[in-house]
């Protein structure tokens, strides 16, 4: 099949880094400067991506692979192949159209990107709040209130009894 295909289509023999040049009777030609083809059999080479402005070069373009960009400090990638850079915010904030805003009460964000999310509702799992939430951290749920009632077995062992006549240090 490969042999048949190459007889029918000479372009199928052109390797990555080249293109099938119609101006040269369909012979394979190397990609011109600042262009690439990452697969064989291409009829054109693609122009290399340029990482400009808020983008910076993570991997240089070559004749067989496109450049790869990431974002300058203070920004993070969004989209396939880092197609966009979005401003970082602080933990406890989210990015709005008006810039970085603190998370509303009852929500948190523990990253420099993304949106503020509601604190976990411990009571939905029948548990109680062990550590309160903040703008930067979710609440920590603890044992259910029933586990803390008198007579119930405690998760932590009881403190050793003090000898009489000694006050705590």
């Amino acid at each position: 099949f490969e042999r048949t295909r190459s007889l029918q289509d000479p372009c199928s023999n052109c390797p990555a880094g080249t293109f099938c040049d119609n101006n040269r009777n369909q012979i394979c030609s190397p990609c011109p400067p600042n262009s690439f083809s990452s697969a064989g059999g291409q009829r054109t080479c693609d122009i290399c991506r340029q990482c400009k402005g808020v983008f910076r070069t993570r991997k240089e373009c070559s004749s067989t692979s496109n450049a790869e960009c990431d974002c300058t400090p203070g920004f993070h990638c969004l989209g396939a192949g880092c197609s966009m850079c979005e401003q970082d915010c602080k933990q406890g904030q989210e990015l709005t159209k008006k810039g970085c805003k603190d998370c509303c009460f009852g929500t948190f964000n523990d990253q420099k990107r993304g949106i503020c999310r509601p604190w976990t509702n411990c009571s939905l799992d029948g548990k109680s709040v062990l550590v309160n939430g903040t703008k930067e951290r979710d609440v920590v749920c603890g044992p259910s209130p029933a586990d803390l009632s008198p007579g119930a077995s405690s998760v932590t062992p009881p403190a050793p009894a003090r000898e009489p006549g000694h006050s705590p240090q």
Epitope: G17, P30, C31, P32, P33, N34, E60, C61, S62, T64
Partner: nanobody, 111 residues
């Protein structure tokens, strides 16, 4: 325009070696892609080896492991070292620098 002149072709036995040279005259300093092609009788011209614009050497499957492309910018010369030559390597070999072609040099592999 750039003028290219190949040399180094000849008659060699199977398994032998040849070194082709391609001397350039004119302004070659902005030329970033160099390549060797060959054309066997009755066949289409084919790309054998090339130095891409990113200075990486590439080879057609038929040349991998046997041929080595190199260049010496101070001498304005490109080379193709051909080892372990086979009967099917018989062709006229052309050097190319973007839009300029040499006149070709004949390589014949025969016992």
């Amino acid at each position: 325009a750039v003028q290219l002149v190949e040399s180094g072709g000849g008659l060699v036995q199977p398994g032998g070696s040849l070194r082709l040279s391609c001397a350039a005259s004119g302004n070659i300093f902005n030329i970033r892609v160099r390549s060797w092609y060959r054309q066997a009788p009755g066949k289409q011209r084919e790309l054998v080896a090339w130095i891409a614009w990113d200075n990486v050497a590439h080879y057609a499957d038929s040349a991998k492991g046997r041929f080595t492309i190199s260049r010496d910018n101070t001498k304005k010369t490109m080379y193709l070292q051909m080892n372990s030559l086979k009967l099917e390597d018989t062709a006229v070999y052309y050097c190319n620098s973007e839009d300029s072609w040499g006149q070709g040099t004949q390589v014949t592999v025969s016992s």
